[in-house]
């Protein structure tokens, strides 16, 4: 079941998913000056069976101005499989959803794809939030949201995250004072300032996850 709405908007924050539940759709969006090829797919769809999930359809973009042929990105299915490297995953990463059954990994890029992807999520999808550059996180709970079905309607849980500019000093009761940091402003194409919080994604341990997110995981 598709979620009726997009995940909640948190001021000065972005959200991302680690993996995508079966049924998720990804729009085939092209960058400015390009369009989907005629008879091309409108979207990619995460499908699968009990043992394997993958994306159906391929997105292809062509120049809006000319009728030249598209350069199609070669699929790399081997990269949907688990990789083993010597690099350690940060212990603060969220639970590795992509290793769970019924989830697709990130679809590969395609030529002249729009920078920002538009997903249509399904019930059970989890997304994680982080403050944008120049803002720091004040956490009151997990910085995540899950699409749930209640009384026949879908809703996203509210992520417990507030992103504050470096100059602001407002705090929640009982919240530790964030460490001092240089003043900041939102990210722009010309300037970026230090984000003062490390990669913090807090997950309720009582959730359906069976393993602790704080165990170090090798890729």
């Amino acid at each position: 079941e598709l979620c009726d709405d997009d995940p909640p908007e948190i001021p000065h924050a972005t959200f991302k998913a680690m993996a995508y539940k079966e049924g998720t759709m990804l729009n085939c969006e092209c960058k400015r000056g390009f369009r989907r090829i005629k008879s091309g797919s409108l979207y990619m769809l995460c499908t699968g069976n009990s043992s394997h999930s993958s994306w159906d359809n391929q997105c292809q973009c062509t120049s809006s101005a000319t009728r030249n042929t598209t350069k199609q990105v070669t699929p790399q299915p081997e990269e949907q499989k688990e990789r083993k490297t010597t690099e350690m995953q940060s212990p603060m990463q969220p639970v590795d959803q992509a290793s769970l059954p019924g989830h697709c990994r990130e679809p590969p890029p395609w030529e002249n794809e729009a920078t920002e992807r538009i997903y249509h999520f399904v019930v059970g999808q989890m997304v994680y939030y982080q403050c944008v550059q120049g803002y720091r996180a004040l956490h009151r709970g997990p910085a995540e949201s899950v699409c749930k079905m209640t009384h026949g309607k879908t809703r996203w849980t509210q992520p417990q995250l507030i992103c504050t500019g470096e100059m602001e000093t407002s705090q929640f009761p009982g919240e530790e004072k964030p460490q001092a940091s240089p003043e900041g402003r939102p990210e722009s194409e010309t300037s970026c300032l230090v984000t003062t919080t490390d990669f913090q994604i807090q997950t309720e341990m009582a959730a359906t996850m069976e393993t602790s997110i704080f165990t170090t995981e090798y890729q």
Epitope: T14, R83, E106, T115, C192, L193, D198, F199
Partner: nanobody
């Protein structure tokens, strides 16, 4: 201030290996996709490899697939490019790039908002 500093380049023989590193600072490295691009003398900068924010999904240019491996260590704010079976046509300046806040991959130059100064890789025959 966002900084990307590449290292590990050098002069090697065809068939040799090199490992490039990119030390990142001034932004939340664990939240961003990253990529490697290269520019050969007299040519345009081209995509080499990219990796998602989690470090779990990767994508490569056809010319390097199977020979190069991109990885990122979110705990150490470092991006890597392991290059093996190097060929003379791999010669060029290799750049590390940070994906924009909302970009899933650092696949095209449009996806990226910050670049390192580059490190020279020269492969002799």
């Amino acid at each position: 201030q966002v900084q990307l500093v590449e290292s590990g380049g050098g002069l090697v023989q065809a068939g040799d290996s090199l490992r490039l590193s990119c030390a990142a600072s001034g932004f939340n490295f664990g939240w961003h996709a990253m990529g490697w691009f290269r520019q050969a003398p007299g040519k345009e900068r081209e995509f080499v490899a990219t990796i998602t924010w989690t470090g779990r999904d990767t994508y490569y240019a056809d010319s390097v697939r199977g020979r190069f491996t991109i990885s990122k260590d979110n705990a150490k704010n470092t991006l890597f490019l392991q290059m093996s079976s190097l060929r003379p046509d791999d010669t060029g300046v290799y750049y590390c790039a940070k994906a924009r806040e909302r970009a899933t991959w650092a696949y095209s130059e449009d996806d990226c908002d910050y670049w390192g100064q580059g490190t020279q890789v020269t492969v002799s025959s």
